[in-house]
Interface confidence: low
């Protein structure tokens, strides 16, 4: 299953399959997740070790048993790969690291005014993997405001040095934020030239393209089909790059297929997994296990559940079957691809779905790094759980926010439905940033069921919580994925980094905003909040947030939206925007429904017909 816990001051001994430099444990964990054999990792921050060579070291590890002995090491951080963790699997990493220089091949330098602009340049450059930016206070004047675009053979820094007034980060191409755009075409009977960065065996050009997309240095590829004239080259997928970023030449060649990495696509990247099953094909590799199962789909599920399994073959040979069950061969290799592909067999083969991000597991998400008053524009994929609840009567308008908490569930405020209880007038838009992007062709979800808390009363502030069951489940993407729910009885005191988002008013007598707004707001104790609202009862089932001096707050149109807090690298839904006296007024904090207090109710209502919870909070 999915294991998300991190172990502080601990280092896994042995099992090494790869090592690299990464700026933090989260990035190390992501590299482990995408490495075909990595199950565990250990990371050494700069503060944990004197050996300069091992500072920022990320050690990827494998283990036949799925675990390794932990040894105490002050400052070290260890954890598990996020394979099998569904929507938490993402190659997107937005963080900017201050005081750190990530070294690599510097291939482009330019003057920019901010680190964000430098990151944007990296994201819009086909070869850039990471960057460093010298701030205006850098000690050498001639280097100030320099933006260095970089790459390396492995896609990670060749070294990381602590350096004042330097900021570093990664390209946001894996966040589907590149402005470059991508070539979706597959070119039949065409071979590309240039430098081969890797060679793997794949059953078709589409698997080859996905592998190219997630390979750090692959920009385009050529695939040799299973009828290619040279037998030893059949099913070979050549991953390629070039100085210019495009093929310098292409040759018409029977039984070859070529195409491009899809990493530069905007808004949609392919999933980092291959779900197709190939009948009449055997995949060869190291044997992990053999089991009798009923049908090829069960074989694939078995492979997916066994975390070390990378691919499988389901044999229909008479000697491999008994009754309705046949042998399911679970296999692996060094690079995650079959070592041999044979055609015309009585088997069916395919890949583990452990890296697919549609798995219906825990609703936690660690990825991402009334208009809000005093807020700023959000960027694509920053708050992927935020939805817009809109009403279509004679025309259509945004009324409330909401939070995606599962494939088919949205959590919002009960008061959003005051006077509008008909579910067919509502349209729910997810995965959007600008309301103006919504046209008559924009897909939306419809409501199957509105579940308003049984104790909610119209125009009262108590129990302002409602669940929406969508008519059809949503797929998860970089821009549309759920927020983690808190643990039951969570105390809010641990949260120091909290944000409210929404398209609501930017001032009390304002206007719905076009771009999703965000504002960083501190939590306020219930005692303090009660002092500010003497005419109202602030209950333990509410949480307050705001600045003493005002100026930043949720407002009309933000209702039902999320108050989220980041703790230990993970975002949690702490509150639901509910009410307040005006917006952003001095000493009048916003009042939010405290989600932790309603966990029993949420879990009870989201039980599916077979009694299995549709979502769960983290252990």
């Amino acid at each position: 299953g999915c294991l998300t816990q991190l172990y502080e001051n601990a280092f896994f001994r042995g099992g090494d399959v790869a090592s690299m430099y990464t700026p933090n444990a989260q990035y190390c964990q992501m590299r482990c997740t995408f490495h075909p054999r990595c199950l565990l990792f250990s990371f050494l921050p700069a503060s944990s070790i004197n050996d300069m060579e091992k500072r920022f070291g990320c050690f990827l590890k494998d283990s036949v048993t799925g675990t390794l002995p932990k040894v105490h090491r002050t400052g070290a951080v260890s954890g598990h790969s996020l394979k099998q963790c569904g929507h938490q699997i993402s190659a997107c990493h937005r963080d900017i690291y201050k005081g750190v220089d990530m070294r690599g091949v510097n291939f482009n330098v330019s003057k920019v005014s901010s680190v964000e602009e430098c990151q944007k340049r990296c994201t819009s450059n086909i070869r850039c993997q990471f960057f460093s930016y010298a701030t205006q206070t850098f000690h050498k004047a001639e280097y100030r405001n320099n933006c260095l675009l970089k790459y390396s053979p492995g896609g990670t820094p060749t070294a990381i040095k602590v350096l004042s007034n330097v900021e570093s980060g990664f390209s946001l191409k894996p966040c589907a934020l590149s402005e470059i755009g991508c070539h979706m075409n597959i070119f039949q009977h065409l071979a590309f030239s240039d430098v081969d960065v890797a060679r793997v065996l794949t059953p078709d050009a589409f698997v080859c393209r996905t592998i190219c997309t997630y390979h750090p240095n692959c920009l385009f590829f050529t695939f040799y089909t299973n009828v290619w004239k040279i037998e030893s080259q059949r099913n070979v997928c050549l991953l390629k790059t070039s100085e210019s970023g495009t093929p310098s030449s292409s040759t018409p060649q029977e039984n070859t297929i070529s195409g491009y990495s899809l990493l530069t696509c905007k808004r949609t990247l392919p999933e980092p997994c291959h779900s197709k099953i190939y009948p009449g094909v055997d995949f060869g590799g190291e044997e992990l296990n053999v089991t009798f199962v009923k049908g090829v789909n069960v074989c694939q599920e078995t492979c997916t559940k066994m975390i070390r399994c990378q691919f499988f073959t389901y044999s229909l040979l008479p000697e491999d079957c008994k009754e309705e069950k046949c042998k399911c061969f679970l296999r692996l290799s060094m690079d995650g691809s079959p070592t041999r592909i044979a055609y015309g067999t009585q088997g069916s083969s395919g890949y583990s779905l452990r890296l697919c991000n549609t798995g219906d597991n825990s609703v936690c998400t660690t990825k991402t790094s009334t208009r809000i008053v005093g807020g700023t524009n959000s960027s694509w994929g920053e708050w992927p759980w935020q939805v817009s609840l809109q009403v279509k009567l004679t025309a259509q308008r945004h009324l409330c926010g909401g939070s995606l908490i599962g494939h088919q569930w949205v959590l919002t405020a009960a008061h959003c439905f005051d006077g509008l209880p008909l579910q067919d007038v509502w349209r729910i838009y997810s995965g959007i940033l600008n309301l103006s992007d919504i046209t008559k062709d924009t897909p939306f979800s419809q409501i199957k069921e509105i579940i308003i808390h049984q104790n909610y009363k119209v125009s009262e502030g108590n129990h302002d919580i409602a669940l929406i069951k969508l008519q059809a489940p949503l797929n998860y993407t970089e821009f549309q994925k759920p927020i983690c729910l808190p643990s039951k009885g969570d105390t809010s005191t641990i949260y120091t980094n909290c944000w409210v988002t929404g398209w609501g008013f930017s001032k009390e007598k304002g206007e719905i905003q076009n771009i999703l707004q965000k504002v960083n707001i501190p939590l306020v104790t219930n005692e303090e909040c009660q002092k500010r609202y003497q005419d109202y009862k602030i209950t333990q089932r509410m949480v307050c947030a705001g600045y003493k001096e005002g100026g930043k707050d949720a407002c009309k149109g933000d209702s039902g939206g999320p108050l989220v807090c980041k703790h230990n690298g993970m975002w949690r839904l702490v509150g639901i925007t509910s009410w307040g006296e005006g917006c952003a007024r001095r000493e009048q904090p916003g009042v939010y429904t405290k989600v932790a207090e309603y966990m029993d109710w949420i879990l009870e209502k989201t039980q599916s017909s077979d009694g299995k919870a549709q979502m769960q909070s983290p252990a």
Epitope: N377, A395, R397, N434, D437, G510, N514
Partner: antibody
């Protein structure tokens, strides 16, 4: 501060096309829609349509559909409005306007297009 | 399309007078209404919008009210710089539509 600077006046013959430009500065060009509104001499205001520079998406007033095309060039932060098959009743001042929320908070200085044989 | 009917089409008033302009929509526009001021040879300027949001640079003597299909713009005490043409505009439903304008002249 936000500034919208439009191209100069044009005189066109009936049946011809005109392309008016609007160069934006002082804000993130790709974040906000740009709308086009026209005003015939001594008449009221008429909304023609909008383009979202970030996505390139457009919305046109049905009245002009088929005759109007809105495009953008993100490298120069410029939007264009092209009106084809011009007739005398298209003589008007054409404005680009940027919303804040939805009302038009910022306007270009206007471009007079005269259609005359 | 939503029709916006403004009245009166013109009015004459003196400095210091209270002036009211009305705007009627052909269907409910849910307060999604803006008012603009335009002076000869110039582009319109946003004056008021939504639920009485006053645009920066305009004096508090301007106020808006209304709901549903009926909306009014009131100038509490007319000043010399207020002589202009005023337009209402709905932004509830595309195509956005404007009223035909009200010209405020010096009596």
């Amino acid at each position: 501060q936000v500034q919208l600077v439009q191209s100069g006046a044009e005189v066109k013959k009936p049946g011809a096309s005109v392309k008016v430009s609007c160069k934006a500065s002082g804000y993130t060009f790709t974040d906000y829609e740009m709308h086009w509104v026209r005003q015939a001499p001594g008449q009221g205001l008429e909304w023609m349509g909008a383009i979202h520079p970030g996505s390139g998406g457009t919305a046109y007033n049905q009245k002009f559909k088929g005759r109007v095309t809105m495009t953008r060039d993100t490298s120069t932060s410029t939007v264009y409005m092209e009106l084809s098959s011009l007739r005398s009743e298209d003589t008007a001042v054409y404005y680009c306007a940027r919303p804040y929320g939805y009302p038009f908070a910022y306007w270009g200085q206007g471009t007079l297009v005269t259609v005359s044989s | 399309d939503i029709q916006m009917t403004q009245s009166p089409s013109s009015l004459s008033a003196s400095v210091g007078e209270r002036v009211t302009i009305t705007c009627k929509a052909s269907e409910d526009i849910y307060n999604r209404l803006a008012w603009y001021q335009q002076k000869p040879g110039k582009a319109p300027k946003l004056l008021l919008y939504g639920e009485t949001g006053l645009e920066a640079g305009f004096h508090l003597r301007f106020s808006g009210s209304g709901s549903g299909t009926h909306y009014t713009l009131t100038i509490a005490s007319l000043q010399p710089e207020d002589f202009a043409t005023y337009y209402c505009q709905q932004y509830w439903s595309t195509p956005w539509t404007f009223g035909q304008g009200t010209k405020v002249e010096i009596k």
